[in-house]
Interface confidence: medium
């Protein structure tokens, strides 16, 4: 139904914002951790993998849910 489609779209849009915020928090935390580790001469590749994942969440998010073409999110969702 249209109501269900709207609800599903709302779920996705909200989830997108949540994921983006989590990404920023996670990257900020990892960056701070990296500074501390580098100060002690440590090396980590954790930041790269996190950055790679979060940078593509928005690109792949529409594939999380089966939507009818007319309710598939467009650039308006990619906030």
């Amino acid at each position: 139904s249209e109501a269900e489609d709207a609800s599903l779209l709302s779920f996705m849009q909200g989830y997108m914002k949540h994921a983006t915020k989590t990404a920023k928090d996670a990257l900020s935390s990892v960056q701070e951790s990296q500074v501390a580790q580098q100060a002690r001469g440590w090396v980590t590749d954790g930041f790269s993998s996190l950055k790679d994942y979060w940078s593509t969440v928005k690109d792949k998010f529409s594939e999380f849910w089966d939507l009818d073409p007319e309710v598939r999110p467009t650039s308006a969702v990619a906030a």
Epitope: E4, L8, F11, G14, H18, D52, V57, K60, D66
Partner: antibody, heavy 118, light 113 residues
């Protein structure tokens, strides 16, 4: 300590209704994505539904779409699952779960048993 | 709907042995742009709720013993218990988080001799 406690399960006749509740504590409920997953005794896990923090976005498994409604009350830190037109295939233990990550459910309740039988 | 098929359906092992559980997806659960696989592994001991072990196919959840590891990509995944212990007797499930509904595999029961 994060805690999820389900309630509201019981015996109901086919075609009947039941509302499950999941009381949450130990985390910021209003920021969490919440889910229901069910398990037929002795069988596997089946994802049922999910809801966003504001409660205005929902997703359902095909098997329950149109019959089940997920909702939440952020003031009461409680998740709900309204189950209508119940069928024998809905007999299962229903778990609520939350995910601190995007894709994985790292916190689960103990489950509540729902039995649909005449 | 993505179908996950686990094998074997059950396995019996002695303490200290290596146990391998496979999970095959009916379609890719990997993001082409970031090469991350949206595949999780859970453990469910008798009478208990599921417990997250592995997410993104190979990332170990906090507090999980190092003997549990995940590998694989695209459609084929593996959960390995390097040296099985008595407390590992349980049913193990894979779950895809790539496309709704977020389906689970049928489960693999691990028993100890």
């Amino acid at each position: 300590e994060l805690q999820l406690v389900e309630s509201g399960g019981g015996l109901v006749q086919p075609g009947g209704s039941l509302r499950l509740s999941c009381a949450a504590s130990g985390f910021t409920f209003s920021n969490a994505y919440l889910y229901w997953v069910r398990q037929v005794p002795g069988k596997g896990l089946e994802w049922v539904s999910g809801i966003n923090p504001a409660g205005d976005g929902r997703a359902y498994a095909t098997s329950v779409k149109g019959r089940f409604t997920i909702s939440r009350d952020n003031a009461k830190n409680t998740l709900y699952l309204q189950m209508n037109t119940l069928e024998s295939d809905d007999t299962a233990v229903y778990y609520c779960a939350t995910a601190s990550r995007v894709v994985a459910y790292d916190s689960w309740g103990q489950g509540t048993q729902v039995t649909v039988s005449s | 709907e993505i179908v996950l098929t686990q094998s074997p359906s059950s396995v019996t092992a002695s303490v200290g042995e290596k146990v391998t559980i496979n999970c095959k997806s009916s379609q890719s659960v990997e993001s082409g742009s970031d090469q991350k696989s949206y595949l999780n592994w859970y453990q469910q001991r008798p009478g208990q709720s599921p417990r997250l072990l592995i997410y993104y196919a190979s990332t170990q959840e906090s507090g999980i013993p190092d003997r549990f590891s995940g590998s694989g990509s695209t459609t084929d995944f593996t959960l390995t218990i390097s040296s099985v212990q008595p407390e590992d007797a349980a049913v193990y499930y894979c779950q895809q988080a790539y496309s709704a509904p977020f389906t689970f595999g049928q489960g693999t029961k691990v028993e100890l001799k």
